[in-house]
């Protein structure tokens, strides 16, 4: 009778085992082992027992001891079970960002590992078991569905294999996949709100504000603001679940025309975008042209107003005839026109909006000098010893210099308060002089003596 020891062995893959083949007869003709495994005989005195070292055991095997005794041949098998932990434990790749409310399928693949009867696959969130299943198939695959919640943000999902050899007197061998860190997010279906000027003038600055509510996690939201190809650099302010991105936008003549203003909010693997058109326009103030800004009284003056080719102008409130970018008026310069403002107002329609620009020029009319009765009376009668202020106003542009002299030497103190004396009486020659010429006027001062009262 042939016997084998041990009859059952569990050993690590690639390991070695000693197998003893024995026979009950004293003088066997033959005693040995049949196995494809590399073997060494570990010699022992005697004929009825042989010990073999079987090495590099890669898979389950059933070496067979045999003996040939006088009463016949017999065999005995030993069962070698190889154990090894899986070579690959992997969660199928998933986008790290997942929207809240989505059903997320976790798929764990396990390659290798034996004995399969003792191999279990566990899907976990942190340390919480989501699913536990025996490893079946090659590769073994275990899946579970998770409804993504906001509080899953930052959670680690992993897959663990458990090769439980404790019933065989060994230990529990665990292998864990690389964790998958879930980033959850909420990006509302509503597009971001974009507030900006609809029209923007060349060489000016505008402010653009993009905002959105109901985001999670708001700090992870990326905001991209752009005007055409120009990326804007916004200052972003965050609320609990909202943000507001404010940026200044400067435009130049190269930007003129219709430009696309975009605000894109990217969160996770989703984005929301708002588009708006901004019309960049160039509209210089209209030009007011005077034949000459300074003319002499009586000169014919042409006032022209010229504006943007598409503008409509009014000159001193009078629309151009025909309505268009040019207007003009003709006048003969009078003293009353001195300091007169000629105002040109131009209106341009840009993207449905009316833009107004004004330009004003002042006309200077050179005239005079003038001395008339109204402003310089020719006769004053004042009581002696009274307080009086002689008044004589000369007109003209430029303002004339005025001097009133009696006998060519004694001045009348124009505009000054004086005590009337006999000396003041007499006829004064008032002379107004400017670059435009000179005029004279006689002014007589009469002093009433008290004895005449």
């Amino acid at each position: 009778q042939t016997s084998v020891s041990p009859s059952k062995v569990i050993l690590p893959r690639g390991g070695s085992v000693l197998v003893t083949c024995s026979t009950s007869c004293d003088q066997p003709k033959l005693l040995g082992i049949e196995t494809p495994l590399p073997k060494k005989e570990l010699l022992l005195p005697g004929n009825n027992r042989k010990v073999y070292e079987l090495s590099n055991v890669q898979e389950d095997s059933q070496p067979m001891c045999y003996s040939n005794c006088p009463d016949g041949q017999s065999t005995a098998k030993t069962f070698l079970t190889v154990y090894w932990t899986p070579e690959r434990v992997e969660l199928a790749p998933l986008p790290s960002w997942q929207p809240v409310g989505k059903n997320l399928t976790l798929r764990c693949q396990v390659e290798g590992g034996a004995p399969r009867a003792n191999l279990t696959v566990v899907l976990l969130r942190g340390e919480k078991e989501l699913k536990r299943e025996p490893a079946v198939g090659e590769p073994a695959e275990v899946t579970t569905t998770v409804l993504v919640r906001r509080d899953h943000h930052g959670a680690n999902f992993s897959c663990r294999t458990e090769l439980d050899l404790r019933p065989q007197g060994l230990e529990l061998f665990e292998n864990t996949s690389a964790p998958y860190q879930l980033q959850t997010f909420v990006l509302p279906a509503t597009p971001p709100q974009l507030v900006s000027p609809r029209v923007l003038e060349v060489d000016t600055q505008g402010t653009v504000v993009c905002s959105l509510d109901g985001l999670f996690p708001v700090s992870e939201a990326q905001v991209h603001l752009a005007l055409g190809d120009q990326r804007l650099n916004p200052t972003v302010t965050y609320g609990n679940d909202s943000f507001s991105a404010k940026a200044s936008v400067s435009v130049t003549a190269e930007d003129e025309g219709t430009q696309r203003l975009t605000c894109a909010v990217i969160l996770g693997n989703q984005s929301q975008e708002t588009l708006q058109t901004v019309t960049i326009y160039s509209f210089p103030a209209p030009n007011v042209i005077l034949t000459k800004p300074e003319v002499s009284e009586g000169t014919e003056v042409t006032v022209k107003c010229e504006a943007h080719p598409r503008a409509k102008v009014t000159l001193n409130g009078v629309p151009a005839q025909p309505l268009g970018p040019r207007a003009q008026l003709l006048l003969k310069a009078t003293p009353e026109d001195n300091g007169r403002s000629f105002s040109c107002s131009a209106t341009l329609e840009v993207a449905g909006q009316l833009i107004h620009k004004n330009q004003t020029r002042e006309l200077r009319v050179l005239y005079g000098p003038r001395l008339d009765e109204r402003d310089c009376p020719g006769n004053w009668t004042w009581p002696e010893n009274s307080q009086q202020t002689p008044m004589c106003q000369a007109w003209g542009n430029p303002l004339p210099e005025l001097k009133c002299l009696k006998d060519g030497t004694f001045p009348l103190p124009i505009g000054e308060s004086v005590t009337v004396t006999r000396d003041l009486e007499g006829t004064y020659l008032c002379r107004a002089r400017s670059t435009q010429g000179e005029v004279t006027r006689k002014v007589t001062v009469n002093v009433l003596s008290p004895r005449y009262e």
Partner: antibody
Framework: EVQLVESGGGLVQPGGSLRLSCAAS????????IHWVRQAPGKGLEWVAR????????IYADSVKGRFTISSDDSKNTAYLQMNSLRAEDTAVYYC?????????WGQGTLVTVSS | DIQMTQSPSSLSASVGDRVTITCRAS??????LHWYQQKPGKAPKLLIY???QSISGVPSRFSGSGSGTDFTLTISSLQPEDFATYYC?????????FGQGTKVEIK
């Protein structure tokens, strides 16, 4: 019948070399392992080296590593121990023995004396 | 290296006595422990392998026991031919190491 016979021992000066042989009969050395074990005069047993004649894998005790080399010749069913840079503390009876974990069969031993 | 310590180093006993020799390993060696008998001028002889496995041709009065770190060789009834030195040896890890020996002498 299993038999192991050592030869090649003798007197050698410190720093000298010696080659011991172990001729096996009654079994094929490729089917097992061959070891050398030594015993200094009046002392205990010390394992020295092992060879797997099937693939020439070898293992040595730290005390002889780099100085001794174990080898085998399948055609002669013989194992060898080449001893170089011999020291006085290498003086011992050298036994060749078989098996992998225990030593069931031993040769009669060969004495190596290292002395000037 | 695993250190093997035998006790006692020597003992005196009479024919018919029960003799026990112990061997302690510096770390666990499972059952990878073997016993040898050596007489002066002779090569050692294997008595027990794997702590307790008997050898064909070795008298049944020799038995072994133990596992882990503590092992025992017992001679149930000492015979005149048993006066010799006994060694234990571990084969759990390289290098294989022997105990220092226990000499059994006639009382």
């Amino acid at each position: 019948e299993v038999q192991l016979v050592e030869s090649g021992g003798g007197l050698v000066q410190p720093g000298g070399s010696l080659r011991l042989s172990c001729a096996a009969s009654g079994f094929n050395i490729k089917d097992t392992y061959i070891h050398w074990v030594r015993q200094a005069p009046g002392k205990g047993l010390e394992w020295v080296a092992r060879i797997d004649p099937a693939n020439d894998n070898t293992i040595y005790a730290d005390s002889v590593k780099g100085r001794f080399t174990i080898s085998s010749d399948d055609s002669k069913n013989t194992a060898y121990l080449q001893m170089n840079s011999l020291r006085a503390e290498d003086t011992a009876v050298y036994y060749c023995t078989d098996s992998g974990y225990w030593f069931a069969y031993w040769g009669q031993g060969t004495l190596v004396t290292v002395s000037s | 290296d695993i250190q093997m310590t035998q006790s006692p180093s020597s003992l005196s006993a009479s024919v018919g006595d029960r003799v026990t020799i112990t061997c302690r390993a510096s770390q666990s060696i499972s059952n990878n422990l073997h016993w040898y008998q050596q007489k002066p001028g002779k090569a050692p002889k294997l008595l027990i392998y794997h702590a307790s496995q008997s050898i064909s041709g070795v008298p049944s009065r020799f038995s072994g026991s133990g596992s882990g770190t503590d092992f025992t060789l017992t001679i149930s009834s000492l015979q005149p031919e048993d006066f010799a030195t006994y060694y234990c040896q571990q084969s759990n890890s390289w290098p294989y190491t022997f105990g220092q020996g226990t000499k059994v002498e006639i009382k």
